[in-house]
């Protein structure tokens, strides 16, 4: 069904990182435009990106209303310059997206090491708690606010002078690790949601090394054997 001069969208794909969520599709329009609708399984359809020639639509504002809901989108095709025209069945052509549950599926963005502080033979490494576009009481929530203890971080660290790596996990945004006195270390972190089956891990953060700007070293620490 449908008019001879419109084609249905295809390859509808959700692209979502830290809840910033865009629906993409094909083909690039030739003499046609698109409108997107989104709804929860039990909700009403809401139209977005009206009569656009783009092949993407930012649906973040809709999905952040409840990130644990499952959403479905559909893309309608209309002839350019004649958006009232419909297919022979009395409806414009459209294609459904796969279902999308933001809480379970949004990709974890690359984390950032906010700081590290050495106090004697301990280093405190802090991961930046990235702000998301999810709101509660008119304030934007951080990744930790949204995921709580479902989100963990894995730290990789190694002496600058050797290749042997160690690892640690935390269910907060801080690591407290033991290091050898007088050695410089490098750090990289990864966000993980262990309860997921897909999109479980982020890419690694940029590597940060001691002796660079982000770190701090405090001398006001005495080892037991210095006492």
């Amino acid at each position: 069904s449908g008019t001879t001069n419109t084609v249905a969208a295809y390859n509808l794909t959700w692209k979502s990182t830290n809840f910033k969520t865009i629906l993409e599709w094909e083909p690039k329009p030739v003499n046609q435009v698109y409108t997107v609708q989104i709804s929860t399984k039990s909700g009403d359809w809401k139209s977005k990106c009206f009569y656009t020639t783009d092949t993407e639509c930012d649906l973040t504002d809709e999905i952040v209303k409840d990130v644990k809901q499952t959403y479905l989108a559909r893309v309608f095709s209309y002839p350019a310059g004649n958006v009232e025209s419909t297919g022979s069945a009395g409806e414009p052509l459209y294609e459904n997206s796969p279902e999308f549950t933001p809480y379970l599926e949004t990709n974890l963005g690359q984390p950032t090491i906010q700081s590290f502080e050495q106090v004697g033979t301990k280093v405190n490494v802090t991961v930046e708690d990235e702000r998301t576009l999810v709101r509660r009481n008119n304030t934007f929530l951080s990744l930790r606010d949204v995921f709580g203890k479902d989100l963990i971080y894995t730290l990789y660290y190694w002496k600058s002078s050797s290749s042997g790596k160690k690892t640690a996990k935390t269910n907060t945004n801080e690591f407290l690790i033991d290091v050898d006195k007088g050695e410089n270390y490098c750090f990289s972190v990864q966000a993980v949601i262990p309860s997921r089956t897909v999109n479980r891990k982020s890419t690694d953060s940029p590597v940060e090394c001691m002796g660079q700007e982000k770190g701090e070293f405090r001398e006001d620490y005495k080892d037991d054997d210095d006492k």
Epitope: V192, P194, K201
Partner: antibody
Framework: QVQLLESGAVLARPGTSVKISCKAS????????MHWVKQRPGQGLEWIGG????????MYDPKFQGRVTITADTSTSTVFMELSSLRSEDTAVYYC??????????WGQGTLVTVSS | DIQMTQSPSSLSASVGDRVTITCKAS??????LSWYQQKPGKAPKLLIY???SLADGVPSRFSGSGSGTDYTLTISSLQPEDFATYYC?????????FGGGTKVEIK
């Protein structure tokens, strides 16, 4: 379903090396961490080391550092452990295990390595 | 390195008994602790993850508790198939370390 299939039993001479494999199915190894665990006859479990197939990072217990290499081939979903300079104390069953972040939730059936002259 | 002290190393119990096994870490492991059951000639089987969560397919008579440095595995009513060796594992920091094991035998 998730499965970890390890290579077969090995008999090796002292001083030589052995490389054993663990083929994963039912999941993408890049989404998890993979580990090797040693168990000598009648003894407890001992962590050897692990690997993050997503970035190639490997971590080892200092007891094995320098003698062990853990790698992953994401194209074949296979994890390898190579142990060199074998001695009689290396006679053991070696298990590969998947780490979800919360636990080692799936284990291979074990590979018996016997070191004997 | 984090040491895991598991106790007791063995115990004798009867079917229907309540059994408690403990693991103490030498420092805070932030609940990155799991419990395993192993039977002779078999690979370990996950019972409890993240200190308190029951793994899929594991009977509800098994439970885990604890935080910080002190963790407990409880079998509320021991069944014939529960006679085995149990291990805790801390995986909060490398090198990962197992407890020494607890062999649960028939009284």
């Amino acid at each position: 379903q998730v499965q970890l299939l390890e290579s077969g039993a090995v008999l090796a001479r002292p001083g030589t090396s052995v490389k054993i494999s663990c083929k994963a199915s039912g999941f993408n190894i890049k989404d998890y961490y993979m580990h090797w665990v040693k168990q000598r006859p009648g003894q407890g479990l001992e962590w050897i080391g692990g690997n993050d197939p997503a970035n190639g990072h490997s971590m080892y217990d200092p007891k094995f550092q320098g003698r062990v290499t853990i790698t992953a081939d994401t194209s074949t979903s296979t994890v390898f452990m190579e142990l060199s300079s074998l001695r009689s104390e290396d006679t053991a069953v070696y298990y590969c295990a998947r780490d979800s972040g919360y636990a080692m939730d799936y284990w291979g059936q074990g590979t018996l390595v016997t070191v004997s002259s | 390195d984090i040491q895991m002290t598991q106790s007791p190393s063995s115990l004798s119990a009867s079917v229907g008994d309540r059994v408690t096994i403990t693991c103490k870490a030498s420092q805070d492991i932030k609940s990155f602790l799991s419990w395993y059951q192993q039977k002779p000639g078999k690979a370990p089987k996950l019972l409890i993850y993240y200190a308190t969560s029951l793994a899929d397919g594991v009977p509800s008579r098994f439970s885990g508790s604890g935080s910080g440095t002190d963790y407990t595995l409880t079998i509320s009513s021991l069944q014939p198939e529960d006679f085995a060796t149990y291990y805790c594992l801390q995986h909060g920091e490398s090198p990962y370390t197992f407890g020494g094991g607890t062999k649960v035998e028939i009284k």
